[in-house]
């Protein structure tokens, strides 16, 4: 058993049929010695008396908020949560496996630039009685500070018969140099509680590996005289690290017909313009990627050819 | 990134072309190592990230763009110098990053060159003959060092009398390639910045 927050304790249980469970001794936080009674949650049934209460915790029915009282007055609370271990593996019931980029990916994180700011998100099908807390650091043995905000519900989607809820959090490394070469990864730890179930999830990454630039901005077409060709131009996204001559991007320009089956023409360039042939009813799209470190491509920025 | 790319102007800053070749070569070598040594811990997640130049050179600090010198987090151990020499800065009156930056890059290359050559000598003794260093990568390191045109004492190649542990050598190769790729990215950024200055 260990303390998660003040008066909130996590009982780690090996979860299998007829498991013996854990014996837990609760102590009432009071100088009083006599006339103390214990109740669970808001039931009036007295579970025991005295300054300590010993319970055998085997299942969720044994967890909850234990309260000690004296003469109708509440003295203290202890909330017991359960953390299940099945076949030596901690449960991951609360969050959904996103399976991208690999199996057992519960947390996904992205950064728009090298400023040390990043966003992580996760998915669940649980709609209520859910709470999260996020901690982060650079490295784990001698951790350097990363500050994370509160996790918030950022999207709701219908997936077949199920509703899916996306939560996200923004974090900022306390003293980040955009030009630094990372040797210690960022660690992100998410505590999740659903009803009386506790779980924790972790992710470890280098900012350079989670970079995904915003799409290029101000995408414009300029027709060339007496030609089916057009000059496409665009700019670096506002959120990208500066100076751009140091933090350079490379671009992919795509001409796509109305039908998805039509052949796509693609050009790769380091410049912020390109000359392409504009077909009728086609659209031109441009996306960006760090020129020197191949992390993710941005989403496409698009304009119609007409 | 095996994709068609519009080529840059040939009359550019002489070292940029070499640094681009360097990044391409080290990235290809790292990819080859990951594939060949698939049963060894050779991915970014599995290895310890060591920097053989740590406390010996200060490339990131010395080559910091002027715009980032206002960022206190970038200035921990920054030594500024505005002396310019070395053929890469030929005829460029720039107060950006000076000899200290380029000589720091040169020292990095020299250190990695020695390590890679020592390692390759060991790998050539491996009866499995599983992996060797790409000669193209070693040649590209050499070309960039020549373009930087700094004179410094030659570092003798390390020789070891004991029997090489090939497993450890291959893991060390992965660690070295990962670190060198990161440094090659920094070098490319610096050369691109200098080219635009």
């Amino acid at each position: 058993i260990w303390e998660l927050k003040k008066d909130v304790y996590v009982v780690e249980l090996d979860w299998y049929p007829d498991a013996p469970g854990e014996m837990v001794v609760l102590t009432c936080d009071t100088p009083e010695e006599d006339g103390i009674t214990w109740t669970l949650d808001q039931s009036s049934e007295v579970l025991g008396s005295g300054k300590t209460l010993t319970i055998q915790v085997k299942e969720f029915g044994d967890a909850g908020q234990y309260t000690c009282h004296k003469g109708g007055e509440v003295l203290s609370h202890s909330l017991l949560l359960l953390h299940k271990k099945e076949d030596g593996i901690w449960s991951t019931d609360i969050l959904k496996d996103q399976k991208e980029p690999k199996n057992k990916t519960f947390l996904r994180c992205e950064a728009k630039n090298y400023s040390g700011r990043f966003t992580c998100w996760w998915l669940t099908t649980i709609s209520t009685d859910l709470t999260f807390s996020v901690k982060s650091s650079r490295g784990s043995s001698d951790p350097q500070g990363v500050t994370c905000g509160a996790a918030t519900l950022s999207a709701e989607r219908v997936r077949g018969d199920n509703k899916e809820y996306e939560y996200s959090v923004e974090c900022q490394e306390d003293s980040a140099c955009p030009a630094a070469e990372e040797s210690l990864p960022i660690e992100v730890m998410v505590d999740a509680v659903h009803k009386l179930k506790y779980e924790n999830y972790t992710s470890s990454f280098f900012i350079r590996d989670i970079i995904k630039p915003d799409p290029p901005k101000n995408l414009q077409l300029k027709p060339l005289k007496n030609s089916r060709q057009v000059e496409v131009s665009w700019e670096y996204p506002d959120t990208w690290s500066t100076p751009h001559s140091y933090f350079s991007l490379t671009f992919c320009v795509q001409v796509q017909g109305k039908s998805k089956r039509e052949k796509k023409d693609r050009v790769f360039t380091d410049k912020t313009s390109a000359t392409v042939i504009c077909r009728k009813n086609a659209s031109i799209s441009v996306r960006a990627q760090d020129r020197y470190y191949s992390s993710s491509w941005s989403e496409w920025a698009s304009v119609p050819c007409s | 990134r095996n994709l068609p790319v519009a080529t840059p102007d040939p009359g550019m800053f002489p070292c940029l072309h070499h640094s681009q070749n360097l990044l391409r070569a080290v990235s290809n070598m790292l990819q080859k190592a990951r594939q060949t040594l698939e049963f060894y811990p050779c991915t970014s997640e599995e290895i310890d990230h060591e920097d053989i130049t740590k406390d010996k050179t200060s490339t990131v600090e010395a080559c910091l763009p002027l715009e980032l010198t206002k960022n206190e987090s970038c200035l921990n151990s920054r030594e500024t110098s505005f002396i310019t020499n070395g053929s890469c800065l030929a005829s460029r009156k720039t107060s950006f990053m000076m000899a200290l930056c380029l000589s720091s890059i040169y020292e990095d290359l020299k250190m990695y060159q020695v390590e890679f050559k020592t390692m390759n000598a060991k790998l050539l003794m491996d009866p499995k003959r599983q992996i060797f260093l790409d000669q193209n990568m070693l040649a590209v390191i050499d070309e960039l060092m020549q373009a930087l045109n700094f004179n410094s004492e030659t570092v003798p190649q390390k020789s070891s009398l004991e029997e090489p542990d090939f497993y450890k050598t291959k893991i060390k190769l992965c660690i070295l390639l990962h670190a060198f790729r990161i440094r090659a990215v920094t070098i490319d950024r610096v050369m691109s910045y200098l080219n635009a200055s």
């Epitope: 908020q65 509160a150 509680v193 009386l196 | -």
Partner: nanobody, 120 residues
Framework: EVQLVESGGGLVQPGGSLRLSCKAS????????MGWYRQAPGKQRDLVAS???????TFQDFVQGRFTISRDSAKNTWYLQMNSLKPEDTAVYYC??????????????WGQGTQVTVSS
């Protein structure tokens, strides 16, 4: 912070029914238990019924079989269905929520109360 607002109280004849609602707003996190309490004039506040996060409900003997407790999770609302009302059920009814918000810790919140009067 968690706010609770009760509604549904009023004047009802003996033998009649009322349904009280308790709507929670704010960051309620994981609710560990919910209780309905009542306070008659000049008396102390007494527990009437409660529900825990395991779905167990408990009722005091004096309302057993007449009152039921339920929850609409989507609306963050709890209900107390009161049937076969008696004059002695006259009181101000309060809802009380206990829960855990990991960024804040344990919390408890009381509603402002709703008056129930059973009289002919």
């Amino acid at each position: 912070e968690v706010q609770l607002v009760e509604s549904g109280g009023g004047l009802v004849q003996p033998g009649g029914s009322l349904r009280l609602s308790c709507k929670a707003s704010g960051s309620i996190g994981s609710v560990t238990s919910m209780g309905w309490y009542r306070q008659a004039p000049g008396k102390q506040r007494d527990l009437v019924a409660s529900a825990d996060s395991n779905g167990r409900t408990t009722f005091q003997d004096f309302v057993q079989g007449r009152f039921t407790i339920s929850r609409d999770s989507a609306k963050n609302t709890w209900y107390l269905q009161m049937n076969s009302l008696k004059p002695e059920d006259t009181a101000v009814y309060y809802c009380h929520l206990r829960g855990l918000q990991l960024t804040m810790g344990l919390y408890e919140s009381w509603g402002q109360g709703t008056q129930v009067t059973v009289s002919s």
